[in-house]
Amino acid sequence: MNGRVDYLVTEEEINLTRGPSGLGFNIVGGTDQQYVSNDSGIYVSRIKENGAAALDGRLQEGDKILSVNGQDLKNLLHQDAVDLFRNAGYAVSLRVQHRLQVQNGPIGHRGEGDPSG
């Protein structure tokens, strides 16, 4: 039997201080550039080496950013989301969703990472 892949989803508040070269990451997503089908959310696509996000260490490529300084990122055009980050100020608070892949046991077996039941 094949194993099953589940995802452990957690949320975290990350406070970044803008560095000399900015926050140091790229994003994909938005209502006009969906990264995930039927999801116009904003996702971290690149953490730049030695940037503020990389030095902090908590933000990861693949994370979904839910809000910036308390402002929801739902239903935004891609460029509007980019502008929001660029105008977010020196101290930037990010609410992020981490999605950790969990390899469970064979199908039919409820592994430790399975939240059901």
């Epitope: 900015g22 994003i27 696509s45 690149r46 490529e61 693949g62 660029r86």
Partner: nanobody, 128 residues
């Protein structure tokens, strides 16, 4: 991190074809711009081709235009380099590379040709 493993290299005759593959693992593949580079013995590494994270944009070095084709299969987490009409000067170690696509939240700037975050170990292509 992203792990990249190249395969498909080998020894071929001039005029032959070869298809290189690069399998990626470790992160969501479909958000990465992917590139192929090569390095001949005693020479510097050079750009060959890139494909954007959406797959909608490709770019090629002048030396391979019309002969090489880069493509990606996001379902298989794999990027390919189809090489036709191979020449002895195509002999090199071919490297696959990845970097997150999308837009910088900091500023609009042109990403450097070699500014990739993850690199494979390479596969040897020899054209006799």
């Amino acid at each position: 991190d992203v792990q990249l493993v190249e395969s498909g290299g080998g020894l071929v005759q001039a005029g032959d074809s070869l298809r290189l593959s690069c399998a990626a693992s470790g992160r969501p593949f479909n958000m990465y711009d992917m590139g192929w580079f090569r390095q001949a013995l005693g020479k510097e590494r050079e750009f060959v081709a890139t494909v954007s994270w959406t797959g909608s944009s490709t770019n090629y070095a002048d030396s391979v235009k019309g002969r090489f084709t880069i493509s990606r299969d996001n379902a298989k987490n794999t990027v390919y380099l189809e090489m036709n009409s191979l020449k002895p000067e195509d002999t090199a170690v071919y490297y696959c590379a990845a970097r997150g696509g999308g837009t910088s939240v900091d500023s609009d700037y042109d990403v450097g040709e070699f500014e990739y975050d993850y690199w494979g170990q390479g596969t040897q292509v020899t054209v006799s």
